[in-house]
Amino acid sequence: KNLKSPQKVEVDIIDDNFILRWNRSDESVGNVTFSFDYQKTGMDNWIKLSGCQNITSTKCNFSSLKLNVYEEIKLRIRAEKENTSSWYEVDSFTPFRKAQIGPPEVHLEAEDKAIVIHISPGTKDSVMWALDGLSFTYSLVIWKNSSGVEERIENIYSRHKIYKLSPETTYCLKVKAALLTSWKIGVYSPVHCIKTTVENELPPPENIEVSVQNQNYVLKWDYTYANMTFQVQWLHAFLKRNPGNHLYKWKQIPDCENVKTTQCVFPQNVFQKGIYLLRVQASDGNNTSFWSEEIKFDTEIQAFLLPPVFNIRSLSDSFHIYIGAPKQSGNTPVIQDYPLIYEIIFWENTSNAERKIIEKKTDVTVPNLKPLTVYCVKARAHTMDEKLNKSSVFSDAVCEKTKPGNTSK
């Protein structure tokens, strides 16, 4: 009896695992084995596919074959008993195009109100993703074990910290990888659960902000208790993206070690151009808080977002304000690379009632003023980019008297 060729061959590639599955064409024939050949693009000869010769089941693994994952290959299969079936040819495919991203590895650490998630590619030193290692982004779904209400967090990297959680609560999460450059979305990891600890005696510092004054950065934060000491650390933001590395070498800011105030000042030259993460920790000598939320700090934006410089031309019922580029030391103007919005606040010198104008233009009219009255003006700049969402500090207030009535020039 002629053996029939196997049918419905499926190629499943997850990371570096190459699996073939097929259907027997004739269930009634026993003791049949199956063998595969492969052919690379531009070759005429067929080569035996190691790992997939004389297989008795309907599944085989050819992961050991060292293929160029970007090169198209063709497969063929036949059934064998005393005689052999004809070859059944599988549509040619490119492994990289066909490959799915496997579930990532997840490692969790718990604090009282935060969880640190470390994510690694499921296959270490993967050949399939060798050129894409740094391009992986991850997304996760997290929920309280008790409620099941899910929250999704997109576009995270190999280390992510989730804050504002409840103490002594079990949270569960699952993570999947994506290679957006190749339009690939991966498979979710198994569910991992961890319980946050009892509430710590000392809360972490909050509301960390960086501003620029002269040639210095000023870092400020809020804290609940007095008589504390604080330390500040920084990390290059790109290190969160390094897939295999889960040793984060946070560095001390020397001028912000054991400070007794809720701010510290350090020279701008501490940081080269780049994006950094900053965090603050509090201590009362006996106990230490967990680290604060990590804030992103971009030196380019921070440096350029100096308060605006402006001139006032006074009329009887209005001010004309002309905004110029802020000056660095040495009176050289700073070049603003980012589109800015200006917030102008003005008030009558004898009153506390402030009025606000938001303007994109650099020449602004402040209307409806009283003649011969002293008004004060201060301004600050905001980036228009939602992601960056930075603001300069306010400029020093400038006070001017409006002209007598009926002056329009």
């Epitope: 490692h107 969790l108 650490e109 718990a110 604090e111 009282d112 470390h118 961890i194 600890t197 009892v198 710590n200 005696e201 590395n245 889960h246 040793l247 070498k249 560095k251 001390q252 006996n286 106990n287 230490t288 967990f290």
Partner: antibody, heavy 118, light 107 residues
Framework: EVQLQQSGAELVKSGASVRLSCTAS????????MHWVKQRTEKGLEWIGR????????KYVPKFQGKATITADTSSNTVYLQLNSLTSEDTAVYYC???????????WGQGTSVTVSS | DIVMTQSQKFMSTSVGDRVSVTCKAS??????VAWYQQKPGQSPKVVIY???YRYNGVPDRFTGSGSGTDFTLTISNVQPEDLAEYFC?????????FGSGTKLEIK
């Protein structure tokens, strides 16, 4: 294969100094933290300090500040522990340890025995 | 400094038994705790890290649990080769600190 090869046992006079070395193979010390840990006979483990060989930044237990100095030579993939003004309290085995992912002390040298004689 | 207290200096157990070694931190250290095993005449080896993760190659009879201030290393089905001293260590804050150790003796 990751290995930490420590220098041989030392017998030194009280008041003198000693420099212990630890040569790493199978990895680049710049990518890790390198720690030194002290263990006295029948006693527990005591962390002395660590270095980030990438930039030389060090951290010490306050009681070892001034007593111990940790340095690194990235060209030879070697870390050093200098101990000075030695007393009998410094008689111990000193371990060189790699600080790896998740800050775990994942590889330990074989230990160097230091005996301080009066 | 954070003090790690291992109240039991010695623990006696039999092959096949289950034994739990405990460690208490003087303040909340999250799950930033590791356990090390030191066999007689050898260097210590990491067994558990991040409170509950088994290090590569460590048999699954070793499990770690706990968070905050209370931590436990459990060895189920104790084997003769588990005769060793076990140390806990916190790495939440500098200076890093170890417990004083618990010696496991096998009857």
């Amino acid at each position: 294969e990751v290995q930490l090869q420590q220098s041989g046992a030392e017998l030194v006079k009280s008041g003198a100094s000693v420099r212990l070395s630890c040569t790493a193979s199978g990895f680049n010390i710049k990518d890790y933290y390198m720690h030194w840990v002290k263990q006295r006979t029948e006693k527990g483990l005591e962390w002395i300090g660590r270095i980030d060989p990438e930039d030389g930044e060090t951290k010490y237990v306050p009681k070892f500040q001034g007593k111990a100095t940790i340095t690194a030579d990235t060209s030879s993939n070697t870390v050093y522990l200098q101990l000075n003004s030695l007393t009998s309290e410094d008689t111990a085995v000193y371990y060189c340890v790699r600080g790896g992912n998740y800050y775990v002390m994942d590889y330990w040298g074989q230990g160097t025995s230091v005996t301080v004689s009066s | 400094d954070i003090v790690m207290t291992q109240s039991q200096k010695f623990m006696s157990t039999s092959v096949g038994d289950r034994v739990s070694v405990t460690c208490k931190a003087s303040q909340n250290v999250g799950t930033y705790v590791a356990w090390y095993q030191q066999k007689p005449g050898q260097s210590p080896k990491v067994v558990i890290y991040s409170a509950s993760y088994r290090y590569n190659g460590v048999p699954d009879r070793f499990t770690g649990s706990g968070s905050g201030t209370d931590f436990t290393l459990t060895i189920s089905n104790v084997q003769p080769e588990d005769l060793a001293e076990y140390f806990c260590q916190q790495y939440n804050n500098y200076p890093l600190t170890f417990g004083s150790g618990t010696k496991l003796e096998i009857k």
